[in-house]
Interface confidence: low
């Protein structure tokens, strides 16, 4: 009865179970009777990250600077290169195949969460009592100025985009 299944880390060749090659190595020759599987190390710039029976190693990913990418972690014979975006940019997708500029929070919205290499800026509307008058990827909403603590009175109310305007206390007539 020919075999149809092999143990973990083995593969089937002509009804014979051969040992797979370990991560970082590719298959040169299948096992044959008493001769074990022949494997060889992946070359520089290549990798295999699993136990395998692959004839070819995979090329390391290229972190293309023209897409705003740079190498975060060098690949090895067992791992792929990981790319990340330059500062001021974030990945456009989960695979981080290219980068785009961080979004700015417009006036009236403040930064809730600063962007990272993998996530964009998260903005939040400024609540009552707070304002933002700039487009920024860093600035949170600022509290309105307290005229009273400065010994002044409110001349103009604040909005989510503008601060309160304070003025001097009106003089009392004798």
């Amino acid at each position: 009865e020919p075999r149809t299944a092999c143990r973990e880390k083995q593969y089937l060749v002509d009804s014979q179970c051969c040992n797979m090659c370990p991560p970082g190595e590719k298959l040169v020759n299948d096992c044959l009777h008493t001769i074990d599987t022949e494997c060889t190390r992946c070359q520089t710039g290549e990798f295999l990250d699993t136990w395998n029976a692959e004839r070819h190693c995979h090329q390391h990913k290229y972190c293309d600077p023209n897409l705003g990418l740079h190498v975060e972690k060098e690949g090895t014979s067992e791992t792929d290169t990981t790319c990340t975006c330059d500062e001021g940019l974030h990945c456009t997708n989960a695979a981080c195949e290219s980068c785009t500029m961080h979004s700015l929070c417009p006036p009236g919205l403040g930064v809730k969460q600063i962007a990272t290499g993998i996530s964009d800026t998260i903005c939040d509307p400024c609540p009552i009592g707070f304002f933002s008058n700039v487009s920024s990827a860093l600035e949170k909403c600022h509290p309105w100025t307290s005229c009273e603590t400065k010994g002044l009175v409110k001349v103009q109310a604040g909005t989510n985009k503008t601060d309160v305007i304070c003025g001097p206390q009106p003089r009392l007539r004798a």
Partner: antibody
Framework: QVQLQQSGPELVKPGASVKISCKAS????????IHWVKQSPGQGLEWIGW????????KYNEKFKGKATLTADTSSSTAYMQLSSLTSEDSAVYFC????????????WGQGTSVTVSS | DILLTQSPAILSVSPGERVSFSCRAS??????IHWFQQRTNGSPRVLIK???QSISGIPSRFSGSGSGTDFTLSINSVESEDIADYYC?????????FGSGTKLAIK
């Protein structure tokens, strides 16, 4: 036009610290990296690290961790590098240079600051 | 760290001659190489970025080529003002590294 103006030469004693500055003008300071590079007398160029003023994030060459500290003041568009526990090995000219966030080389350089460590 | 080997250490040429500088990386770095000129007591100045991309304001006699591990900077007709040290630098990964430089001298 883009300019990086560095502080003047420094003569410091062994064991002391020094802080050198690099004032940027002519571009948006928070949108570009500032890199620092060391050039020892008669020698080549050695990369120390960068700071991105827009976020304050830094990256150091392992060789200079604990030796150099990079900071930036966005209100004055000035980057700083502090060198600590100075020895004669730290005597060198230090350059600041600008690099864009992508597709760019170190495109503008300061004139260099000479640091001499001597007792 | 990626090692950049520049050769020769000194190049001596006559004005008007073509000259080539070599830079070899210890591993494949795509086209992430930049070339700088540094005159005596001056700051480095970028000549070529990403192996072959020209830089605004740099004379057209400067050109670059190569990818992977072998890179070349060429000056197609050397002028006396080109006397300087020439460095390659990689931006493929941190830490950025520079070559040891090649000094250009005029015969």
């Amino acid at each position: 036009q883009v300019q990086l103006q560095q502080s003047g030469p420094e003569l410091v004693k062994p064991g002391a610290s020094v802080k050198i500055s690099c004032k940027a003008s002519g571009y948006s300071f928070t949108s570009y990296y500032i890199h620092w590079v060391k050039q020892s007398p008669g020698q080549g160029l050695e990369w120390i690290g960068w700071i991105f003023p827009g976020s304050g994030n830094t990256k150091y060459n392992e060789k200079f961790k604990g030796k150099a500290t990079l900071t930036a003041d966005t209100s004055s568009s000035t980057a700083y590098m502090q060198l600590s526990s100075l020895t004669s090995e730290d005597s060198a000219v230090y350059f600041c240079a600008r690099r864009g966030t992508t597709r760019d080389a170190l495109d503008y350089w300061g004139q260099g600051t000479s640091v001499t460590v001597s007792s | 760290d990626i090692l950049l080997t520049q050769s020769p250490a000194i190049l001596s040429v006559s004005p008007g001659e073509r000259v080539s500088f070599s830079c070899r990386a210890s591993q494949s770095i795509g086209t992430s190489i930049h070339w700088f000129q540094q005159r005596t007591n001056g700051s480095p100045r970028v000549l070529i970025k990403y192996a072959s991309q020209s830089i605004s304001g740099i004379p057209s006699r400067f050109s670059g080529s190569g990818s992977g591990t072998d890179f070349t900077l060429s000056i197609n007709s050397v002028e006396s003002e080109d006397i300087a040290d020439y460095y390659c630098q990689q931006s493929y990964t941190w830490p950025f590294t520079f070559g040891s430089g090649t000094k250009l001298a005029i015969k």
